[in-house]
């Protein structure tokens, strides 16, 4: 089941998925002046079995005289089955690379890909939040968000993170990149009174990013 929305935005914070659940799709988008090769895949798909997961398909971009304006669509399950499998593994990966069962790593970059990567997340996907440089974290709970299915609808849990502008004495003390976990932390889901404001995307930009404009897609 695909998640309907993007993960929530937290002021002065950035999020990342450290691994992608099987079923996740990544659009094959190319930067301006390039387009997908004619026989190229529309998307990559995280697939696998109990012991190994990898990305099916490979995104490839080629130079184009005109800008590629083809709108990306979420592929249907029957389309997914027909696509050729090409394992995407980065060369020279260190041996200590963590591998989470049922999850794929970030796909390696491909030539002339678009700046933003558009993922179609599935239920159970987790993303992790960190305050950007110049801000420190005030935690009320987990600094993560999980896409959950509640009463037939998908929603992202609200990360319990506040980033305050107080400068730290040392840069990012004790911070560590979180290890991806296949299960979200338990939380009460007895109530179905979920309103859109619970996961409204906040558009306040981090102070260090104020000169740039980004889409709300995961980059």
């Amino acid at each position: 089941e695909l998640c309907d929305d993007d993960p929530p935005e937290i002021p002065h914070a950035t999020f990342k998925a450290m691994a992608y659940k099987e079923g996740t799709m990544l659009n094959c988008e190319c930067k301006r002046g390039f387009r997908r090769i004619k026989s190229g895949s529309l998307y990559m798909l995280c697939t696998g079995n109990s012991s190994h997961s990898s990305w099916d398909n490979q995104c490839q971009c080629t130079s184009s005289a005109t800008r590629n304006t083809t709108k990306q669509v979420t592929p249907q399950p029957e389309e997914q089955k027909e696509r050729k499998t090409t394992e995407m593994q980065s060369p020279m990966q260190p041996v200590d690379q963590a591998s989470l069962p049922g999850h794929c790593r970030e796909p390696p970059p491909w030539e002339n890909e678009a700046t933003e990567r558009i993922y179609h997340f599935v239920v159970g996907q987790m993303v992790y939040y960190q305050c950007v440089q110049g801000y420190r974290a005030l935690h009320r709970g987990p600094a993560e968000s999980v896409c959950k299915m509640t009463h037939g609808k998908t929603r992202w849990t609200q990360p319990q993170l506040i980033c305050t502008g107080e400068m730290e004495t040392s840069q990012f003390p004790g911070e560590e990149k979180p290890q991806a976990s296949p299960e979200g932390r338990p939380e009460s889901e007895t109530s179905c009174l979920v309103t859109t404001t619970d996961f409204q995307i906040q558009t306040e930009m981090a102070a260090t990013m104020e000169t740039s404009i980004f889409t709300t897609e995961y980059q």
Partner: nanobody, 130 residues
Amino acid sequence: QLQLVESGGGLVQAGGSLRLSCAASGLTFDGYAIGWFRQASGKEREGVSYINGRDGSTFYADSVKGRFIISSDNAKNTVDLQMNSLNPDDAAVYYCAVDRLGSRGAYVSSWWRSPDMDLWGKGTLVTVSS
């Protein structure tokens, strides 16, 4: 598949300088943090420096602050590491690496960890003689 190619390594005397370069032809720089790790013989690979390809912000490990300078040329798809005042502790194989930026094009230093990079170069050897 896109590749990272390092150059500029070599033998230098203590106190000397070297300039490493990482060529990443075809890489969409403004979607990545691009930078350097190093691995000395018998030691773990450690993050040295990176530059955010979107906003140009930089990070340096404490051990190289004030001596190393990272820079990028997005038009040429290269990232350089100017290494000054080299000492024997800097001797290592230096690897170029890239890691996807987070949302809003931001990146934090705690993500610059060896197990989590998206792509690696093959490395270039830096030897510092005393």
